[in-house]
């Protein structure tokens, strides 16, 4: 769709006469009609079949023809047309005397024609006025001529409609050859897909709207980029949604349960080194002067008996001193000035010479140490007790007082919960420190695997898609995750396609 | 008194080139389109070319496009034909003529003969 | 491209006699066809246009009629002058086609 516009420039009737040779009278006074009509290898008499239009009385004789356009005029003439612009035509312009009022060429003798053009033109749509002039023996015409499309309608031929919009059938304007030019924001062939938060993830994320990112199931954070680990996932990352990837030092199903009690609590206390020993188990190796599962003990430097050979110790601020009975000297009483004549060693010790008879060597019976079998054995100062066990002294022996959950001489045995076999259906049997958990098979879930439930949520294939489907360990359900386009718990709804011709 | 006047006709090898012209007077040359016809020997009338009244449209019979070429002076009143890689097929009288039945407009010249012959 | 079958080719009369030509596009030209007369050595001469329109100073024995495709050329009564090759023209669509010449000849 579109409109011929046609603008007459001048007229020349220098004469006032009419075709036939006759002068007007008193002047001819000149109007036009206008026939547009398809090409015609010869200009042949027709219908006018792009349209015709009259002028009124614009002048008499010779004179110019007034650009009316601005003020609503009718120059240029306008004949619209409502299909698509061929290229060529042939245009028929006809000058008319009126001698009265009446313009209707039935009301007009046949010889009130002063001149008459015609001609085959090309001219394609947009093109800047073209300018002709036809000349004759008594009249002279200035006229030039354009094709605009009208209003939605572009295109070489004005045959592409186009109407903005900005609405949910599409966000654009039209460009001057008819193609969609999307407003800021938007994409696609109707610019119905908004262009979402820049870096806003593309399977992750979605929008409605430009600048927006919201997240499919699973995802999180500003653009989607951050999966959403396993319901009740304590110390553990994902990689995909519903993950629970334990941090290092954390290990079970959620990642609570704690490998790692040295670097996650620091039990041990005045520059102790600690051990990992198992599940929230762990040992402290004090350094010296301190004692206690946790060394938070403070030893008085003489509590280690430094002094030998009966030598008695006092504490002082910067350490011990022992004093040396007789026949003994050095820091810790260790010299000896006695010989076995002197029975030096006591508790039933035996005594045997050294070095010529200059020094000795006493022999202990069970139970005594010391050079002189002076000191009874003390049997937990190797700290024989495992998992925090406190060592007591019974005599000749010794006994560990083992931490709750342990057991064994040594305390080396964790209590176990899971000797009796609590796990129904073939579950697996884990050892906690106040209890047990059980792992189940697939199809059984509860405390001790005694409830039966569905194999796998995702064994069903209930997504749509293709999307990815993944099993909510905690529920028992399952999540799909949907592919770009598509929306809704099984992602079964298309997000907004258009319709083939939105207007 | 209207007139068209063709000339540059005569013979020609195969191959060669001739230039026709058509000199217009008695009428506003200008005004309308004008047409190329020619009648090979003992034969009917065939259309060759044509050119709008201000040399924007052309057009020619699938036999000459390419070879020949159709123009116009206004300012001279003239028509041309240049012709081209002339065959024996194109031998014939060549006319001008100014044709708009629209204004009753029907002119043609006398004609003039084309002999392509080795 | 637009055929133009003209019929018939040739045709024998006497002078008075009154005589039809025909002509029929190979698609609808509306009413763009001409009518020319030709006699030896001279160029064409046009006598209708637009189908049925006399042109100016043709003797009113010729007349024509038709549109679309079919075209009828009639001189009401021969004279020894209308004795030529006739050739239909369509002037709808180029190439430009004439008919294939109708020769009238003295019986």
């Known amino acids: 769709s579109g409109v011929f516009q046609l603008q007459l420039q001048e007229f020349i009737n220098e004469r006032g006469v009419l075709a036939s040779g006759r002068p007007c009278e008193p002047g001819c006074r000149t109007f036009f009609r206008v026939c547009l009509k398809h090409f015609q290898a010869v200009v042949s008499p027709g219908p006018c079949t792009f349209g015709t239009v009259s002028t009124p009385v614009l002048g008499t004789n010779s004179f110019a023809v007034r650009d009316d356009s601005s003020g609503g005029g009718r120059n240029p003439l306008q004949l619209p047309f409502n299909f698509t612009w061929p290229g060529t035509f042939s245009l028929i312009i006809e000058a008319w005397h009126a001698p009265g009022d009446d313009l209707r060429p039935e009301a007009l003798p046949p010889d009130a024609l002063i001149s008459k053009i015609a001609i085959q033109g090309s001219l394609a749509v947009g093109q800047n006025w073209l300018l002709d002039e036809q000349t004759s023996t008594l009249t002279r015409l200035r006229y030039s001529y354009r094709v605009i499309c009208s209003d939605n309608y572009y295109g070489d031929n004005c045959s592409r409609l186009c109407k903005k919009r900005n609405d949910h059938f599409g966000h654009y304007v039209c460009q001057p050859d008819g193609n969609l030019s999307c407003l800021p924001g938007w994409t696609g062939e109707y610019c119905q897909q908004p262009i979402c938060l820049s870096g806003c993830h593309e399977q992750n994320g979605y929008c409605s709207k430009p600048a927006e990112c919201l997240c499919r199931p699973g995802w999180q954070g500003r653009l989607c980029n951050e999966c959403i680990p396993h319901n009740g996932c304590r110390h553990g990352t994902c990689s995909t949604p519903w993950q629970c990837t334990c941090d290092e030092g954390w290990g079970g199903l959620f990642c609570d349960q704690d490998l790692n009690y040295c670097t996650h609590h620091s039990p041990c206390k005045n520059g102790a080194t600690c051990s990992n020993s198992g599940q929230r188990s762990y040992t402290c190796t004090c350094r010296p002067g301190y004692t206690g599962v946790d060394c938070e003990l403070e030893l008085s430097e003489c509590d280690s008996n430094p002094c030998r050979n009966g030598g008695s110790c006092k504490d002082q601020e910067d350490g011990y001193h022992c004093l040396c009975p007789p026949g003994y000297y050095g820091l810790h009483c260790e010299h000896s000035t006695l010989s076995c004549a002197d029975s030096p060693c006591f508790n039933g010790g035996s005594c045997r010479e050294r070095n010529q008879g200059a020094n000795y060597a006493c022999e202990c019976p069970p139970n005594f140490t010391g050079s002189n079998c002076e000191k009874k054995v003390d049997r937990c100062t190797s700290n024989p007790c495992a998992n925090g066990g406190q060592c007591l002294n019974r005599g000749p022996s010794r006994m560990c007082r083992c931490r709750p959950g342990f057991t064994g001489t040594y305390c080396e045995l964790h209590v176990s919960d899971c000797a009796r076999n609590p796990c129904a259906h073939g579950g697996t049997c884990h050892d906690l420190e106040n209890g047990l958990m059980c792992t189940c098979p697939a199809g059984f879930s509860g405390r001790r695997c005694e409830v039966r439930t569905s194999i796998d949520a995702c064994a069903s294939s209930p997504c749509f898609n293709r999307a990815t489907c993944y099993t909510d360990l905690s529920t028992d359900t399952f999540v799909c995750n949907c592919p770009y386009g598509f929306v809704g718990s099984r992602c079964e709804f298309p997000v907004g396609l258009p319709p083939s011709f939105p207007w | 008194e209207v007139q068209l006047v063709e000339s540059g006709g005569g013979v020609v090898q195969p191959g060669r080139s001739l230039r026709l012209s058509c000199a217009a007077s008695?009428?506003?040359?200008?005004?309308?389109?004008m047409y190329w016809v020619r009648q090979a020997p003992g034969k009917g009338l065939e259309w060759v070319a044509f050119?709008?009244?201000?040399?924007?449209?052309?057009y020619y019979r699938d036999s000459v496009k390419g070879r020949f070429t159709i123009s116009r002076d206004n300012s001279k009143n003239t028509l041309y034909l240049q012709m081209n890689s002339l065959r024996a097929e194109d031998t014939a009288v060549y006319y001008c003529?100014?044709?708009?039945?629209?204004?009753?407009?029907?002119?043609w010249g006398q004609g003039t003969m084309v002999t392509v012959s080795s | 491209d637009i055929q133009m079958t003209q019929s018939p080719s040739s045709l024998s009369a006497s002078v008075g006699d009154r005589v039809t030509i025909t002509c029929r596009a190979s698609?609808?030209?509306?009413?763009?066809l001409a009518w020319y007369q030709q006699k030896p050595g001279k160029a064409p001469k046009l006598l209708i246009y637009?189908?049925?329109r006399l042109q100016d100073g043709v003797p009113s024995r010729f007349s024509g009629s038709g549109s679309g495709t079919d075209f009828t050329l009639t001189i009401s009564s021969l004279q020894p002058e209308d004795f030529a090759t006739y050739y239909c023209?369509?002037?709808?669509?180029?190439?430009?086609?004439f008919g294939q010449g109708t020769k009238l000849e003295i019986k």
């Open positions: 023209l369509q002037g709808s669509k180029f190439p430009l086609t």
């Open positions: 050119i709008s009244h201000g040399g924007g449209i052309t």
């Open positions: 637009a189908a049925n």
């Open positions: 698609e609808d030209i509306y009413s763009n």
């Open positions: 003529a100014a044709l708009n039945w629209e204004l009753g407009i029907d002119y």
């Open positions: 008695g009428f506003t040359f200008s005004n309308y389109g």
